[in-house]
Every structure is written in C-alpha cells, then in structure tokens.
C-alpha cells in the first residue's frame, strides 16, 4: 500500500499546533485511503528545507527568497503548489517588483547613479533585494558593506530599517530610518509617498502599490515605470516592464520522489473543505494564534505548479540574477560595452557538431550549449544557460509566451537588400505521391501522416489547426491510422511510422530520421501517404539535390500538393495550392541579450553567410547537407525585424490566433509552465 502521508514541516510552536489541527480536521473529512497529514517541527525554514531534502519531511510553504535557497544544491527542492490571492476567476500567484518614477523626470534604468531612491525597507524583496541585486554590478567598489556601496551610488535615500548612524545617506530622505509605520516613508505606501512628495526620484515597490495609493487614473498617469531595457512604460504595463516577477508563497518538495501529486491532492481537498469561507471550525488561511501560520492569511486558495517548472523557471531569470548577485557578490572584471560570447543552443549531437565548428571559426564570439529538445533549449535560454537559437514559428510562439523575443528572421529569397527586408513567410503544404490519385484534403481520415514535429508550423500547427476546425477534437492519433510526428507520446500511433532506433524513436531532434522537413518528406517517400512540410521541401530533395541513398533518384514530378478545395496541383503551383502562409523561422533570445545577439549574428553572417561560395573548404553558417542544422539550409540571410520585435507582431495576428486555438490540444509542458507565470 503506497504511503499517502504528507509530512508537513512547521517552524514554531504555533505552526505545530495549527498543523496538528490541520491533520485532525483532514482525518475527519477524507476517506481512510486518501491523503493524510503528519507534522514535523523544526527550528527554522532552512532546517525544514534540509529535512525535506533528507526525506525527513515532505512539504513546507516558503517566500520567494527561501524558494531560491531550497532550489540550491544540495537541497534541490522544487515548487509544487502556489498560493493565490485575489479571486478564483483571476488568481494572482505572483507580484511584480517595479521602479516607479515621475513622468517628467527623463532618466532611464541605466542612469540611476546619483539619483535619490525610496525603498520599502532594508532587506525586503521589491524594495531592496531585487533592485539592489539587479544594480549590484553597477555599484561602486568595494561593494561590501552593501549599504555603503548603495549609499555611494544614490545621492540620497530612504531605506527604512537601515543603520542611520553608520549609513546616514540611506536615511537622508527619512531621518532616523524608522522600521515601522511611524516612519511616513516605510513600506510600500511609504516608499511611494517618498516619491510622490518629491523627496526621491525613484521608488522601488510592487506593481499594485500605485493603484492602491492613487485611485484616479489621471493621477496615475503622472507616473511611469522604468524598464530593464532602458525604456519607460505606463504604470498599467507592469507585465511588460518590471524588475522581476516574484512568486508570493509556494509549497516546495523534493525534485525526485517528492510526492508532488499527493501534496496537490491533499491541498486541493483541504481548500475544498477548509478554504476561504468554507468552515467555521478550521480555516486553512487563518491564524488565530499568530500570523501566516503554514500558509498566508491573505491567500484565497492553491494552484498546482506545472510539473515542467523547476525553481529557476518559477522564480524567473531577473529574480534569480538579482538574488544570486547579492548572495555571491561576483561581477565581471570591469563592466564593458563589449558583448560577451553568444551561447547558441544546439539540438542533439548533429547540431552540436555544426555549432562546435562555428564556435572555433567565430574566434570566441559563439559558444555552444546542448539540449535534447527545442523546449529544453528554450528553457535554457530563459534561465540564462544559453542565449539564442533559430526557431520555427510554432516555437517562436512558445518562446514568446515564455518571455523571449525574436531578434532576426531567416530570409529564403535572394534579393539585393536581404538583411533589411524580412519576408512575408513561406507556404505550408500537404504533399502526396502522384500515384495515390484518389487522395484529397477531404479524405485523409485513416491515412498515414508524416509531420516535421509536434508544435512546428508547417508540420503541425497549420495542418492540425485546420483539421481541428473540421473534427472539433484533439485526437489526431485517431484521425490518422498511423504516422510520424516527432515529439508525440511514444505509445501514440503518431510515433508508429517513425524510424529512430531505441530511445531516439519519435524524438523531436535529428536522431529521429523522420524529423524536420527532410525527415517528414523521407517518411512520405518510404512509408506515408501525406507529408506536411514547406513549399521548398520537395524541390530541395529531388532531382539529385539530396545525395542521400533514399533521395538521390527521386523526381519532383512524382509528387503533388493537396489543395484545401479538394483538388490537387503540381508541386510548383504551391502559391495557389497551400494550407497557409507560415512565418519564417526566427532567432530568439532574452530581452537583455537582444542587442548583443543582433550585433554578433550580423557580424557572423557577413563572415560565414551566403557570400561564402566554397562550403567544402570553408565554414558555411547556412549549410548542412539538407539537415537544416541550426538554421534552415535555404537561408540566404538573417534579416532585421524593424518594428516586428515581439512574438505577436512577428508571427502576425492570424497565426497567433490559429496557434491559440490549438492550445487546447497542446501537449507542450513548457507552454503550460510559461502560461502559469503569465496567463
């Protein structure tokens, strides 16, 4: 019988008492085969973290800073359940740390030196740790003691709770630096008042502070937010302009064997019976003998944290950077305007080979990081382990939802001004063998399908989106008799046709021979009835252009396209017979790396781009013998995006809507995780 006990860790007598009450009340409402609570008492949160890591306890609820500690080795804990605030309809699990300024003040984030600062309090998250952590490497040396460095960075501050004797500049705007509401500039509202009164130039608070203090929109319009990219935005655009997004209060567990499903089952049942306004005799979110015991008193309920989400992703790149800077206190030798090497994310060992070759030829401008799937690469870019990669539009969508931005687009047509002219896109098509003359768009049910990969544009999002509109369900593996759609569940019929050996079967990388455009076409040639690819795929792999044994004798004339009106056309008539126009592949990165990735990639393509004529004796960035490694092989150049510099603008309203409709069919664990952070 599996042990269904969750050992909750309590950090005080009062918490232990509430925990025992929680245990007893749960016993009274949950059947004997359901989850139960046991209580473990420790002296501190850090002791609780160690106890969970050592399998002496299973769960505890922590503030963001402690979630970071819990994640660090050797603890390796992960977030499993989040408290939410506000309403069930609009649950808030995060708040945003922001830098508020007056509208007419005219400086940016990188010009804060010498300004006057208002803080909620020394050592507090939004008011101190996050802004000072992010500014850490700009502080004058020596950076220890930190208070002294901060005092020398700003021309005056109010940092309640600071030592006014040792660091008078930190109390210059609020004499005494009182650590309670007796100090008019203490806390969120106090720090905002410090700005409003004109004492300070910038207030470090949370996104809701300005709304709580200024009910009138006209008054709020006198203020702006400083963004990390050295721009400003209106105060209601905090989701796109903040210092960090911070989880409020989170239950953590072991990463391996951590009982996360059991913990969720327990807490979900607990909120049903003892949540807000549920029971008089025991309330989960109330602390008669103290404050915030086990859970925050202000919480309204729990949400399950998606399983794909580790602590780094949950806390977010900015928050982790700020806290790591403060804790480790390490900075680059001297901040320079020169770009650091771009860490390119390579998928599996084929891309890694090409990336290694690029790296040595780039003389230190490019470094390589490996991952097994595109989603793993996106996650690595999000958390700073990697910086950039080129993605199909379907993954540009996921990357965008995860906070990454497109920076350059692949262009596939030769033109005089390639780098300045991003193209409208390529065509997604359905290819069949000419010999299967009865096959049309309208009778694909029960046929064998070949896809580039799940989540990709031409191979999945466009054809499956059109199919979904017809069949109104997501069971595509029942619609086709079998197929190869790399990235599907291994036991799905959509992995049956795949050719990868062992663990590589149906993997969404080049270890699966039927992966990508060329792979999907090969799948059609060898096993399938229809392939969903791009309009250039057939000509690129026929007429001897692909020398691989399976392709070298193929003839373009032996294939036709399926048109949406039920007719068929020759391959060259793709402009009048396609499923949809697809956005070109694009390079994505984090916002903080955008300028450097843009600069370095433009240099790299001038050295190794289409201007290189002999690829047998020189490194060619856009060539890999039909394998589309790192970039599509038909890339002519990487083009500037001009104003199409967000994923929505880049992909276009129509495509974003189409992928949005398919979201209900999505199996992307990363998309689920990212929409948890930003619904």
């Amino acid at each position: 019988v599996p042990d269904k006990t969750v050992r909750w860790c309590a950090v005080s007598e009062h918490e232990a008492t509430k925990c025992q009450s929680f245990r007893d009340h749960m016993k009274s409402v949950i059947p004997s085969d359901g989850p139960s609570v046991a209580c473990v008492k420790k002296a501190s949160y850090l002791d609780c973290i160690r106890a969970i890591a050592a399998n002496e306890a299973d769960a505890v609820t922590l503030d963001a800073g402690l979630v970071y500690d819990a994640y660090l080795a050797p603890n390796n804990l992960k977030p499993v359940v989040a408290e939410f605030y506000g309403s069930k309809e609009d649950p808030q699990t995060f708040y945003y740390a922001v830098a508020v300024v007056k509208k007419d003040s005219g400086f940016q984030m990188n010009q804060l030196r010498g300004k006057k600062s208002c803080h909620t309090g020394l050592g507090r998250s939004a008011g101190w740790n996050i802004p000072i952590g992010l500014l850490y490497c700009d502080l004058p040396e020596p950076r220890k003691p930190l208070e002294k460095a901060v005092a020398n960075f700003f021309s005056g501050s109010c940092a309640p709770c600071a030592d006014g004797t040792d660091f008078p500049q930190l109390c210059q705007l609020c004499p005494g630096c009182g650590c309670s509401t007796l100090n008019q500039y203490f806390g969120y509202s106090g720090a905002f008042k410090c700005l409003k009164d004109g004492a300070g130039d910038v207030a470090f608070v949370k996104h809701s502070t300005i709304f709580e203090n200024l009910a009138n929109k006209a008054d709020r319009d006198q203020y702006e937010l400083l963004c990390l990219d050295n721009t400003r935005k209106p105060v209601d655009e905090y989701k796109d302009c903040h210092l960090a997004q911070v989880p409020s209060h989170t239950v953590v567990a072991r990463s391996m064997g951590g009982k996360e499903d059991l913990i969720w089952e327990l807490l979900n049942q607990a909120q049903e019976h003892f949540g807000k306004d549920k029971s008089k005799e025991f309330q989960l979110f109330s602390s008669p003998h103290g404050k915030d015991l086990l859970f925050k008193d202000s919480a309204h309920g729990f949400l399950k944290v998606p399983p794909r989400m580790d602590a780094k992703m949950y806390l977010g790149y900015e928050y982790v950077t700020a806290i790591r800077n403060l804790r480790e206190g390490t900075c680059p030798e001297a901040p320079t305007d020169e770009c650091k090497p771009v860490k390119w994310c390579a998928l599996s060992h084929h891309e890694r080979l090409k990336c290694d070759e690029w790296s040595v030829n780039s003389v230190g401008k490019i470094e390589c990081v490996s991952a097994e799937t595109t989603e793993d690469c996106i996650a690595k870019i999000m958390n700073g382990e990697a910086d950039a990669m080129s993605l199909d539009g379907g993954f540009v969508y996921i990357a965008g939802k995860c906070g990454l931005v497109p920076v350059l687009a692949e262009n596939y047509n030769k033109s005089d001004n390639c780098e300045d002219t991003p193209e409208a896109g390529y065509f997604a098509i359905a290819v069949v063998k000419k010999s299967a003359s009865d096959l049309t768009w309208d009778n694909l049910k029960g046929k064998k399908s070949c896809h580039t990969a799940v989540g990709r544009t031409a191979g999945w999002n466009i054809p499956m989106g059109l199919l979904y509109n017809k069949i109104n369900h997501c069971r595509f593996d029942e619609f086709f008799s079998e197929g190869c759609a790399p990235g599907s569940k291994k036991d799905s019929s959509l992995c049956k046709l795949c050719m990868g050996s062992g663990l590589n079967l149906c993997e969404p990388n080049n270890k699966e021979g039927y992966y990508g455009y060329t792979g999907a076409f090969r799948c059609l040639v060898e096993k399938g009835d229809v392939a969903f690819v791009k309009h250039q795929t057939v000509p690129q792999n026929t007429g001897g252009k692909n020398p691989d044994p399976w392709a070298k004798n193929l003839n373009e004339k032996d294939y036709e396209l399926l048109c949406l009106d039920g007719t068929r056309k020759p391959v060259e008539e793709y402009a009048n017979c396609h499923l949809a126009r697809a956005p070109n592949h694009a390079v994505v990165t984090r916002k903080d790396k955008e300028a450097c990735v843009h600069k370095i990639l433009r240099q790299q393509q001038h050295l190794f781009g289409s201007n290189v004529t002999d690829c047998s004796g020189n490194f060619c960035l856009f060539r890999s013998e039909t394998k589309d490694l790192l970039f599509r092989d038909d890339t002519v150049c990487l083009a500037k995006l001009h104003d199409r510099n967000t994923y929505e603008k880049y992909l276009g309203e129509e495509y974003v809507k189409a992928v949005g409709n398919l979201r209900k069919c999505s199996t992307s664990s990363l998309l689920e995780a990212c929409t948890f952070r930003r619904p």
Partner: nanobody, 117 residues
C-alpha cells in the same frame, strides 16, 4: 572524400602524457576545420578541441591548459598533445574534419585512452 585514422592511444598513469595523431588519406590543406572528440562510457560524444586552417583553436573547459591541438598540413596530420592526464580523460578519442559524413554518424574507429594507476 578524405579518410581519417586516429592513433596514439594507450594506458597511462594519472599525471602522464600522450600524443594522439589523426592521419588523413589525402590533403588536409583545403579542410577548414578539424577537431578531436571523445566518448566516455555511457556518455554522449563531446568536443575536446578544434582548430581552423588559420590556426584558431577552441578547447573544452575541462581540458584547457592541459591539452594542445595542432595540425601539420604538409604531413596531412592533426595532433592532440595531452598532458596532466586525469582518470576522467578515459575515453575513445575520434578526429573529424566536419564533413557531411559526421552528420551521418559515420565516425572512424577512434583510439582508446585509459588513465589509471
């Protein structure tokens, strides 16, 4: 297409040295980039060092300062000088010229290096 053959491996004590050679069946002068990879038991093949025709080099962090890559275009040979060897350097070492056959997983036999006391 030029064929490459690795040699020079063997058993060596920790702290010892070895020099691996990669001999080509034809001219390597026109080959832009060459590299050494290794595969440790149960692990993915990984880059050890790479070198371009112009002499730019790149090393894995774990071998920086201990290993040195070079090529002699006149002798159509590339070398890997390995000093201060550690047990974790134990692997099969392969050389590559980054031609299309490596994207097809068509690698040579490699040469076994074992570092043990």
């Amino acid at each position: 297409q030029v064929k490459l053959e690795e040699s020079g491996g063997g058993l060596v004590q920790p702290g010892g040295s070895l020099r691996l050679s990669c001999a080509a069946s034809g001219s390597i002068f026109s080959i832009n980039t060459m590299g050494w990879y290794r595969q440790r038991p149960g692990k993915q093949r990984e880059l050890v060092a790479a070198i371009t025709r112009g002499g730019n080099t790149n090393y894995a962090d774990s071998v920086k300062g201990r290993f040195s890559i070079s090529r002699d275009n006149a002798k159509n040979t590339m070398y890997l000088q390995m000093n201060s060897l550690k047990p974790e350097d134990t692997a099969v070492y392969y050389c590559t010229d980054y031609s299309r056959r490596y994207y097809q997983d068509d690698w040579g036999q490699g040469t076994q290096v074992t570092v043990s006391s």
